[in-house]
């Protein structure tokens, strides 16, 4: 008889799931030398333990310290970019700009980016056909602790002037409840992180105005500030150009604003 | 054609309030672009009080309507809205409506009310 | 706020003659994005202004090609190369570089 399964909100585990962890592991081992020690079926390992036989709305930060261990990583100061609701454009600069890195340019980041997880208490399946809703189910589910593990590390490593990119296209540019506004924001260090600067992306119709000026703009300086950690904005008018620019920086029309 | 629509002529005592609406008969691109509030007094020129993206709700205002004016806008019956409080004499003047064109220009403009503050 | 200043405050042409408006703005217009929002409107007597020239010197759809502006920074004109009697109204420039937005006093164009 099929054994009962628990039904919840969200879509279940990415198909291949395992094949797919594993495989970027390899493959980032390969491109990243510094890397090359890592022992990719540990990798898998320490993940799989992390939320395997576990109730998938019981996940604690503890459960991802051996992967956090194993996966290890420094960014060298002024070059770690972090980015809210704006993930693709985030991810083309640093193609672009490669001496910058997001969170998903890390191993742990890399191995996880949009995949879906979970398992069941007390089986060793993983769950292909449901995982727990961040809002409908549960928060303490193994994607959404997995991202706040990695991202407060990721915060917590950071050094020097911080970028982070934000969509000026949102209602809320910057939004206390996304995982930078909750979770990034509070766990840079002021001994560490002289500044943030806020890059706010508008959208892909010509504006004039200054999105730095938002209220919630505002209130991500304020929190900033009272960390004693400098804060300073810019406008990205156009964010087609200014990856253009990236790319060409000495073409002629980059003199001109972006 | 009328592209903007507002409402008509208002007349209102000292210390009240009014709303203004101004409906848009584009209403692809009402929600995506933005929507400014002019107002026009005899001797004074123009005055630019505030400016609503409609789909979001992003407000700009200009500092000296702060707190005289409320922007608002409804994406299903494509409405932007103008509320002022506290009237006086000094408010009495025609209010414009006008959408973008291309970003940050003023291309379509609505008819104008005209409000009156008298006691 | 950026002050917007118009010349002449009044202008008496004759029909099929050319009219040039100037207007000087307190502070440049040159927005960091590179484009310098700089605009020109018509308001007929009982009308809603309409917009003639966008971005210094583009002319808005509809526009007949009498109207050209031209500027640069601070310095900004429109010019009418021959007036016709339905041109007759006031002129205003507007400046969308820096919030909030301001207008001209406006200009009248009126015949001689």
């Known amino acids: 008889l099929p054994r009962w399964r628990q039904q919840w909100s969200g879509s279940g585990t990415t198909s291949r799931f395992p094949e797919t962890v594993l495989a970027r592991c390899v493959k980032y081992t390969e491109v990243h030398p510094e890397m090359r020690h890592v022992d990719c079926q540990s990798v898998w390992d320490a993940f799989k333990g992390a939320f395997i036989s576990k109730y998938p709305c019981n996940i604690t930060e503890e459960d991802y310290q051996p992967l956090v261990k194993l996966g290890t990583q420094t960014v060298p100061c002024n070059k770690t970019l972090l980015w809210s609701r704006i993930k693709d454009l985030a991810h083309q600069f640093t193609q672009v700009q490669r001496d910058m890195f997001t969170l998903e340019d890390m191993l742990l980041g890399y191995l996880a980016d949009d995949l879906t997880w979970c398992g069941e208490f007390n089986t060793f399946e993983i769950n292909y056909q449901s995982c727990p809703d961040w809002r409908k189910d549960c928060s303490n589910n193994p994607v959404s602790v997995f991202w706040k593990t990695v991202s407060r590390r990721f915060a917590e490593t950071a050094c020097g002037v911080v970028h982070v990119m934000l969509n000026g296209s949102r209602s809320k540019i910057f939004d206390k409840n996304s995982t930078f506004g909750s979770v990034e924001v509070h766990n840079l260090q002021p001994e560490k992180v002289q500044a943030l600067e806020a890059w706010v992306i508008h959208g892909g119709r010509e504006d004039s105005r200054d999105l730095c000026q938002d209220p919630t703009i505002k209130e991500l300086e304020s929190i900033i500030s009272k960390r004693n950690i400098r804060f300073f904005c810019k406008n990205i008018y156009r964010p087609d150009k200014f990856l253009q620019c990236v790319k060409n920086p000495e073409d002629s029309s980059c003199l001109s604003g972006i | 054609q009328v592209q903007l629509q507002q409402s008509v002529s208002e007349l209102r005592s000292p210390g009240s309030s009014v709303k203004l609406s101004c409906k848009d008969f584009?209403?692809?691109?009402?929600?995506?672009?933005?929507m400014s509030w002019v107002r026009q007094k005899p001797g004074h020129g123009f005055e630019w009080i505030g400016d609503?993206?409609?789909?979001?709700?992003?407000?700009f205002y200009g500092e000296k309507f702060e707190d005289k004016a409320k922007l608002d806008a409804d994406t299903v019956s494509n409405t932007a809205y103008l509320e002022l409080t506290s009237l006086s004499s000094e408010d009495s003047a025609i209010y414009y409506c006008?959408?973008?064109?291309?970003?940050?220009?003023?291309?379509?403009w609505g008819q104008g009310t005209l409000v009156a503050v008298s006691a | 706020d950026i002050v917007m200043t118009q010349t002449p405050l009044s202008l008496p042409v004759g029909l099929g003659d050319q009219a040039s408006i100037s207007c000087r703005s307190s502070?440049?217009?040159?927005?960091?994005?590179?484009?310098?929002?700089l605009h020109w409107y018509l308001q007929k007597p009982g009308q809603s202004p309409k917009l003639l020239i966008y971005k210094v010197s583009n002319r808005f759809s509809g526009v007949p090609d009498r109207f050209s502006g031209s500027g640069s920074g601070t310095d900004f004109t429109l010019k009418i190369s021959r007036v016709e009697a339905e041109d007759l109204g006031v002129y205003f420039c507007s400046q969308s570089s820096h919030l909030p937005w301001t207008f001209g006093g406006g200009t009248k164009l009126e015949i001689k």
């Open positions: 502070q440049s217009l040159l927005h960091s994005n590179g484009n310098t929002y």
């Open positions: 006008a959408r973008e064109a291309y970003g940050s220009i003023l291309g379509y």
């Open positions: 609503i993206l409609p789909n979001i709700g992003r407000i």
């Open positions: 584009d209403s692809e691109v009402f929600p995506t672009s933005y």
